[in-house]
C-alpha cells in the first residue's frame, strides 16, 4: 500500500517557555526510521520516542521541553522507503511572548502531520 503520513498540516503558535510534543504517524511500513527535521537540519535522534501502534503503524514524538525563540521554524518528519525519502508536510512553529495567549490553527488539506500534542 506504500507509505502514509497521516494528519493535517498545522500552524502552531506557542507561548515562550511552554512545552510541546509534535507527533508524526507513519502507516504502511514496518519499523520506519522516522527522522525529524527543522529548517532543513535533522533533529538529534535522542529527542524523540517511537511507539508501534501496530506492525505497520508507528508514531514518532518529538519533545520540546521549553520552547524558545531558537525553536521557532518549520518542522517536518521524513522516512526512507525503498531508497527514497518520503517527506511530510511541514508544521510551522511560531512563538508569542511569555504569558500571552497562544492559539494553534489547523489548516485542513492533504498533509503528512497528525496534530501536535501539548503537555504541561
Amino acid at each position: 500500500a506504500g507509505l502514509k503520513l497521516m494528519g493535517a498540516p498545522v500552524k502552531l503558535t506557542v507561548s515562550q517557555g511552554q512545552p510541546v510534543k509534535l507527533n508524526c504517524s507513519v502507516e504502511g511500513m514496518e519499523e520506519p526510521d522516522i527522522q525529524w527535521v527543522k529548517d532543513g537540519a535533522v533533529v538529534q535522534n535522542l529527542d524523540q520516542l517511537y511507539i508501534p501502534v501496530s506492525e505497520q503503524h508507528w508514531i514518532g514524538f518529538l519533545s520540546l521541553k521549553s520552547v524558545e525563540r531558537s525553536d521557532a521554524g518549520r518542522y517536518w518528519c521524513q522516512v526512507e522507503d525503498g531508497g527514497e525519502t518520503e517527506i511530510s508536510q511541514p508544521v510551522w512553529l511560531t512563538l508569542v511572548p511569555r504569558g500571552s495567549s497562544a492559539h494553534h490553527h489547523h489548516h485542513h488539506h492533504h498533509s503528512a502531520w497528525s496534530h501536535p500534542q501539548f503537555e504541561k
Epitope: 519499523e31 526510521d33 529527542d47 514524538f61 500534542q117
Partner: antibody, heavy 125, light 108 residues
Framework: EVQLVQSGADVKKPGASLTISCQAS????????ISWVRQKPGKGLEWMGQ????????LYGPSFQGHVTISADRSTATAYLQWRSLEASDTAMYYC??????????????????WGPGTLVTVSS | SYELTQPPSVSVSPGQTARITCSGD??????AYWYQQKSGQAPVLVIY???KRSSGIPERFSGSSSGTMATLTISGAQVEDEADYYC???????????FGGGTKLTVL
C-alpha cells in the same frame, strides 16, 4: 513479560578483547532503543551509548566513542557491547537498558524502561 | 563535556521530606529523569520528564524543575527509600545522555 538476559561475569587480562551480550524477549526487539550503562565498583552510573535494533543506529557518549562498539543482531534479538583492547579501568558492572513508550488511550506517550541484571567485567593482570 | 551536579549525600529522619537537587546548564531545555539504586541492585526509573512518576512508584516521590535545577522530593521518607539517587538528562547538544554523580540518601 519483558526480559533482558545478560551474559555472565567475565575476567580478562589487559589488552584482551571481549564482547558481552544482552538478549531481549517479550517484545519486538527492533521497536526500541537499547542503552548500555557502566558502573565502576563503588561509583556512579555512566551512559555509554545506545542502539536502535531495526536500523542499528548507534550513538555514543563522548568518553566511550572509539573505545567500545555497540551492535545488534535482529535475528537473535541481541545487543552487544564490544572491546578490542580492554584496560584495567574497564573493570565495572555493565547494564543494558531498554527504552520504550506507550500510549494508554491518549496520544501523549508514557515512557518506561527495563534494566538487565548487569554483567560484571573484571580486567586484571 | 556536559555535567550534571548532585550533592554527594542527603540525610533525613523517617517521615521527613527529603530533597535531592541536580543542576545542569541544559536543564531549562532538557527533561530530567531520576533513578533509585538500592545496594546490589539494578537502578529503577522513578521520575521521567521532570515530574512524571514511573509506573509502580509510590506517590511520595515527586519531581520538579526550574531553570537549571531539577529536584527530586520524597515526602515522608521511609527507611526503605534509603538508596543512591541519580539524575539523568540529555546533553546541551542533545546527542548523548549524562548521569549526575549520584546522591546517597540516608534515612535514620
Amino acid at each position: 513479560e519483558v526480559q533482558l538476559v545478560q551474559s555472565g561475569a567475565d575476567v580478562k587480562k589487559p589488552g584482551a578483547s571481549l564482547t558481552i551480550s544482552c538478549q531481549a524477549s517479550g517484545y519486538t526487539f527492533t521497536d526500541y532503543w537499547i542503552s548500555w550503562v557502566r558502573q565502576k565498583p563503588g561509583k556512579g552510573l555512566e551512559w555509554m551509548g545506545q542502539i536502535r535494533g531495526q536500523h542499528s543506529s548507534t550513538l555514543y557518549g563522548p568518553s566511550f566513542q572509539g573505545h567500545v562498539t555497540i551492535s545488534a543482531d535482529r535475528s537473535t534479538a541481541t545487543a552487544y557491547l564490544q572491546w578490542r583492547s580492554l584496560e584495567a579501568s574497564d573493570t565495572a558492572m555493565y547494564y543494558c537498558v531498554r527504552h520504550g513508550a506507550s500510549t494508554s488511550g491518549g496520544t501523549i506517550p508514557e515512557y518506561y524502561q527495563h534494566w538487565g541484571p548487569g554483567t560484571l567485567v573484571t580486567v586484571s593482570s | 563535556s556536559y555535567e550534571l551536579t548532585q550533592p554527594p549525600s542527603v540525610s533525613v529522619s523517617p517521615g521527613q521530606t527529603a530533597r535531592i537537587t541536580c543542576s545542569g546548564d541544559a536543564l531549562p531545555k532538557k527533561y530530567a529523569y531520576w533513578y533509585q539504586q538500592k545496594s546490589g541492585q539494578a537502578p529503577v526509573l522513578v521520575i521521567y520528564e521532570d515530574a512524571k512518576r514511573s509506573s509502580g512508584i509510590p506517590e511520595r516521590f515527586s519531581g520538579s524543575s526550574s531553570g537549571t535545577m531539577a529536584t527530586l522530593t520524597i515526602s515522608g521518607a521511609q527507611v526503605e527509600d534509603e538508596a543512591d539517587y541519580y539524575c539523568y538528562s540529555l546533553s546541551d547538544s542533545g546527542n548523548y545522555f549524562v548521569f549526575g554523580g549520584g546522591t546517597k540518601l540516608t534515612v535514620l
